[in-house]
């Protein structure tokens, strides 16, 4: 997160850290807890690393430096990448993770509400992006979970800023014209959440941007409302019943 500040304990209890353990262990992506046994993240996090057993998912944490060999973590039972996601393209950047064992909810570890299907009418004015990603383009992973308040921008405006790409209706953009505040490397897969009528909703999944926090280069997020059918289909068919935090 560029231009952000430290988060507090329990402020973003749905935020998880997706880490890979090969020779060393490192944080690669963020994710959002959406049910006892489900995490929503970006498909591109798994490019080149599709093996379930190398991943460790840490929930209910604030500081990555607090993680030791004794810190509990979840393992992956199943990775469900959107069927239309292609490594060579930037569309449908969404994936579900089914955890091997359900998580108990606590003050520091609980799910985020999902939006209603095709939610286009709600005007979100209080949106935040969180993660342990770089604090500048050529930076490094941060220890303390960062947060930043970023306004949504229209897809029309976003398309003007990214003429080499197609900004689809299944994407949502956020950023300041002058730059300075944005997600960055390592924040991928994490949440863009907006507070509406007193409740936080998962509006976007951190996907991509041209650099980080550059002027007139907003961050691009996978629009969760556009994938509600897919999320419900995959979580229900796998579970037998949905275990999601219901849409508001």
């Amino acid at each position: 997160i560029v231009g952000g500040t430290n988060s507090s304990w329990g402020e973003w209890p749905w935020q998880v850290s997706l880490q890979v353990k090969l020779t060393a262990q490192r944080h690669l992506c963020g994710g959002s807890l959406i049910g006892h046994q489900w995490v929503l993240t970006a498909a591109h996090c798994f490019d080149g690393l599709p093996l379930q057993d190398v991943w460790r998912i840490y929930s209910g944490i604030l500081n990555l430096s607090d993680i030791t060999k004794d810190t509990p973590f979840s393992q992956i039972k199943e990775i469900i990448i959107h069927q239309n996601y292609k490594v060579s393209e930037g569309n449908h950047d969404i994936a579900l993770i089914k955890l091997q064992a359900p998580l108990n909810y606590t003050e520091f570890q609980k799910p985020i509400c999902l939006p209603s299907k095709g939610d286009t009418s709600t005007i979100y004015t209080n949106c935040w992006v969180t993660g342990w990603g770089f604090s500048k383009e050529k930076g490094e992973i941060q220890n303390i979970l960062q947060k930043v308040n970023i306004p949504l921008v229209t897809n029309e405006e976003c398309q003007k800023r990214y003429q080499d790409y197609k900004i689809t209706q299944r994407m949502v953009c956020a950023g300041y014209k002058e730059g300075g505040k944005d997600a960055c490397k390592g924040d991928s897969g994490g949440p863009l959440v907006c507070k509406h009528n007193g409740m936080w909703r998962l509006v976007g999944i951190t996907s991509w941007g041209e650099g980080c926090a550059r002027r007139e280069q907003p961050g691009v997020y996978t629009k969760v409302a556009e994938y509600m059918d897919w999320i419900l289909e995959k979580t229900q068919s796998s579970d037998g019943k949905a275990q999601m935090q219901s849409p508001a």
């Epitope: 292609k86 393209e89 080499d164 790409y165 960055c184 951190t206 991509w208």
Partner: antibody, heavy 125, light 108 residues
Framework: EVQLLESGGGLVQPGGSLRLSCAAS????????MVWVRQAPGKGLEWVSY????????YYADSVKGRFTISRDNSKNTLYLQMNSLRAEDTAVYYC??????????????????WGQGTLVTVSS | DIQMTQSPGTLSLSPGERATLSCRTS???????LAWYQQTPGQAPRLLIY???SRATGIPDRFSGTGYGTDFTLTISRLEPEDYGTYYC?????????FGQGTRVEIK
């Protein structure tokens, strides 16, 4: 299966013109960025030109700027390179290639994942 | 313009040997925009590595890419007869997009 098939090459005199075509199939052409790359006999690869999916954005190598024009007809799944004021140093095999723009580490990637077989352009008097 | 300098110009190796090809850039290049291609005589180039280290579909795991910033490396762990040819690195971080001059890998 992705396929790119160039045509339109041949022998042309210096100062002459030629229009190359690249017929694309096996993917959604209208959503992909495309490039032309050339290779002079016995030499290395040289990027020539780029075009965005809509055709609204184009870029050129300095060596061809003002002489070559890249365009596309998404309804025909075809990429073009109009070459004017040709010079001897434009003699090369011209390849069209698809630009893959995936995502990695919250940034876009860029690479040429599929190439045509090439068409030879010879500029000689 | 970003200049791409490959070394060595030619590499003479026997099958089974390890090949290490270097690519240096004149300016910082985001790894996401660095690719390697293989070309054999009379053929179009073929994508090997993208994002500096990710193998393209169908590329055997004897090919690997590493590097960051201005120094990138392509390694072929054990040369097979079909690996002989010319290898190019390429950046599309900034226009004009540029290729290295190539490294020719020949049979010793």
């Amino acid at each position: 299966e992705v396929q790119l098939l160039e045509s339109g090459g041949g022998l042309v005199q210096p100062g002459g013109s030629l229009r190359l075509s690249c017929a694309a199939s096996g993917f959604t052409f209208s959503s992909q960025q495309m490039v032309w790359v050339r290779q002079a006999p016995g030499k290395g690869l040289e990027w020539v030109s780029y075009i965005s999916p809509s055709g609204g954005n184009t870029y050129y190598a300095d060596s061809v700027k003002g002489r070559f024009t890249i365009s596309r007809d998404n309804s025909k799944n075809t990429l073009y390179l109009q070459m004017n004021s040709l010079r001897a140093e434009d003699t090369a095999v011209y390849y069209c290639a698809r630009v893959a723009r995936g995502i990695a580490a919250r940034s876009r990637t860029s690479y040429f994942d599929y190439w045509g077989q090439g068409t030879l352009v010879t500029v000689s008097s | 313009d970003i200049q791409m300098t490959q070394s060595p110009g030619t590499l003479s190796l026997s099958p089974g040997e390890r090949a290490t090809l270097s690519c240096r850039t004149s300016q910082f290049v985001n790894s996401n925009y660095l690719a390697w291609y293989q070309q054999t005589p009379g053929q179009a180039p073929r994508l090997l590595i993208y994002g500096a280290s990710s193998r393209a579909t169908g590329i055997p795991d004897r090919f690997s890419g590493t590097g960051y910033g201005t120094d990138f490396t392509l390694t072929i762990s054990r040369l097979e007869p079909e690996d002989y040819g010319t290898y190019y690195c390429q950046q599309s971080s900034r226009t004009p997009w540029t290729f290295g001059q190539g490294t020719r890998v020949e049979i010793k």
